[in-house]
């Protein structure tokens, strides 16, 4: 008779995800020669121990704090790029701009970039079959927690200017309930970072609207100001031609506006 | 060899501050936790806090905490660790060490802070 | 905090012993638990890290076993350099805590 499982609202841990994530730390650490250190079963093990056995809905940052530990690295303070809800193309333009990083170029970004997984309270068992939904189950799941305390270590390292990516197509450009905006902005420490500037990706080829003057946009220079950083905004009008300039910045067409 | 050489010996009074340096050769000072553990004559080991050197992260036991301050300068490959308001029962051997595996695999030699008026 | 208790707090045994001290977690640490020797007027040595992994140059008659809340080391045949204080230590969350040592003495 098999026995009774706990069903979710979100998908099951990602297949194969042990293997997943230990070749991932080993690809990790061979590119990047400065974390050669890191021994990889190791942070597994770290990884494992976080949410193997534990509740899924009953998830603390402290249960991540070996992982937090083996897995800290050192990023250039000032080159931190942030992003909401446009992720690849941040991660396009940190693969060009290669001395700028978004929390997924870094070790722990990496490990668990587009993975799910959750354990069963009492059982060594991964469960592939349902994990917690964020707003379906509860907040206090193995993912959600994972990604809220990688965020808020990500950020109080940020220093001098940092920069977010932020999706101008969205209806709420600047979401308070988004990683960034429920984390990210309120752990940028003001004593070490003096602007947080913005950059609003435009979605239609003819969009020519200042989407710095959105709303949200506002309410977002509001919460940073507050917080006695400063805050300046950018349209990227065409982020195609914004990509391009990056890789070749010498193009005469570069010089315009993007 | 990994080598992890503190500063000397120090009396200080009741009140006053101490900062206690640590200065690590034989690798990258930069990848690896320095851990802060002091021993008060005759007693066990009680860890202060630590510092990641690349990245300034820190974290201190609650119990020294706003006391304590673990500074780290990376031209020099050198930790430091500055306890204030001394008072005597902060008399101890204090040790600086490299973490490794939420273990600590290199020790300094220690340092004995004595507080006396 | 974490407690971390061993036992005993001292014993006396004699040259080409085997001796056993244990370390008890007052939570599960999983195996993030190091073991230190100290001799007298000296800085602690790692022994073990990660519950059973010799660290570099330590004799193999030194072993760790054990996961979760429950640690072993284990010295299979005591020798003279070996009467020390032995002290285990967790890494799962801060503060990281020390056991209060156990003093092995001669026999």
């Known amino acids: 008779v098999p026995r009774w499982r706990q069903q979710w609202s979100g998908p099951g841990t990602t297949k194969r995800f042990p293997e997943t994530v230990l070749a991932r730390c080993v690809k990790y650490t061979e590119i990047h020669p400065e974390m050669r250190h890191v021994d990889c079963q190791s942070v597994w093990d770290a990884f494992k121990g976080a949410f193997i056995s534990k509740h899924p809905c009953n998830i603390t940052e402290e249960d991540y704090q070996p992982l937090m530990k083996l897995g800290t690295q050192t990023v250039p303070c000032n080159k931190i790029l942030l992003w909401s809800r446009i992720k690849d193309l941040a991660h396009q333009f940190t693969q060009v701009q290669r001395d700028m990083f978004t929390l997924e170029d870094t070790l722990l970004g990496y490990l668990a970039d587009d993975l799910t997984w959750c354990g069963e309270f009492n059982t060594s068992k991964i469960n592939y079959q349902s994990c917690p939904d964020w707003r379906k189950d509860c907040s206090n799941n193995p993912v959600s927690v994972f990604w809220k305390t990688v965020s808020r270590r990500f950020a109080e390292a940020a220093c001098d200017v940092v920069h977010v990516m932020l999706n101008g197509s969205r209806s709420k450009i600047f979401d308070k309930n988004s990683t960034f905006g429920s984390v990210e902005v309120h752990n940028l420490q003001p004593e070490k970072v003096q602007t947080l500037e913005a950059w609003v990706i435009h979605g239609g080829r003819e969009d020519s609207r200042d989407l710095c003057q959105d709303p949200t946009i506002k309410e977002l220079e509001s919460i940073i100001s507050k917080r006695n950083i400063q805050f300046s905004c950018k349209n990227i009008y065409r982020p195609d031609k914004f990509l391009q300039c990056v890789k070749n910045p010498e193009d005469s067409s570069c010089t315009s506006e993007i | 060899q990994v080598q992890l050489v503190q500063s000397g010996a120090e009396v200080k009074k009741p009140g006053s501050s101490v900062k206690v340096s640590c200065k690590a050769s034989?690798?990258?000072?930069?990848?690896?936790?320095i851990e802060w553990v002091r021993q008060a004559p005759g007693q066990g080991l009680e860890w202060i806090g630590d510092?990641?050197?690349?990245?300034?992260?820190?974290d201190y036991n609650e119990k020294f905490k706003g006391r304590a301050t673990i500074t780290a300068d990376e031209s020099t490959s050198t930790a430091y660790m500055e306890l204030s308001s001394l008072r005597s029962e902060d008399t101890a051997v204090y040790y600086c060490?490299?973490?490794?595996?939420?273990?600590?695999?290199?020790w300094g030699q220690g340092t004995l802070v004595t507080v006396s008026s | 905090d974490i407690q971390m208790t061993q036992s005993p707090s001292s014993l006396s045994a004699s040259v080409g012993d085997r001796v056993t001290i244990t370390c008890h977690a007052s939570?599960?640490?999983?195996?993030?638990l190091g073991w230190y020797q100290q001799k007298p007027g000296k800085a602690p040595k790692l022994l073990i890290y990660?519950?059973?992994n010799l660290h570099t140059g330590v004799p193999s008659r030194f072993s760790g076993s054990g996961s979760g809340t429950d640690f072993t080391l284990t010295i299979s045949s005591l020798q003279p350099e070996d009467f020390a204080t032995y002290y285990c230590?967790?890494?799962?969350?801060?503060?990281?805590?020390f056991g209060q040592g156990t003093k092995v003495e001669i026999k």
């Open positions: 060490a490299r973490g490794r595996d939420l273990a600590m695999d290199y």
């Open positions: 034989g690798y990258t000072f930069t990848n690896h936790w």
């Open positions: 510092i990641f050197p690349g990245g300034g992260y820190t």
């Open positions: 939570q599960n640490i999983n195996v993030w």
């Open positions: 990660k519950a059973s």
């Open positions: 230590q967790q890494g799962q969350s801060y503060p990281y805590t």
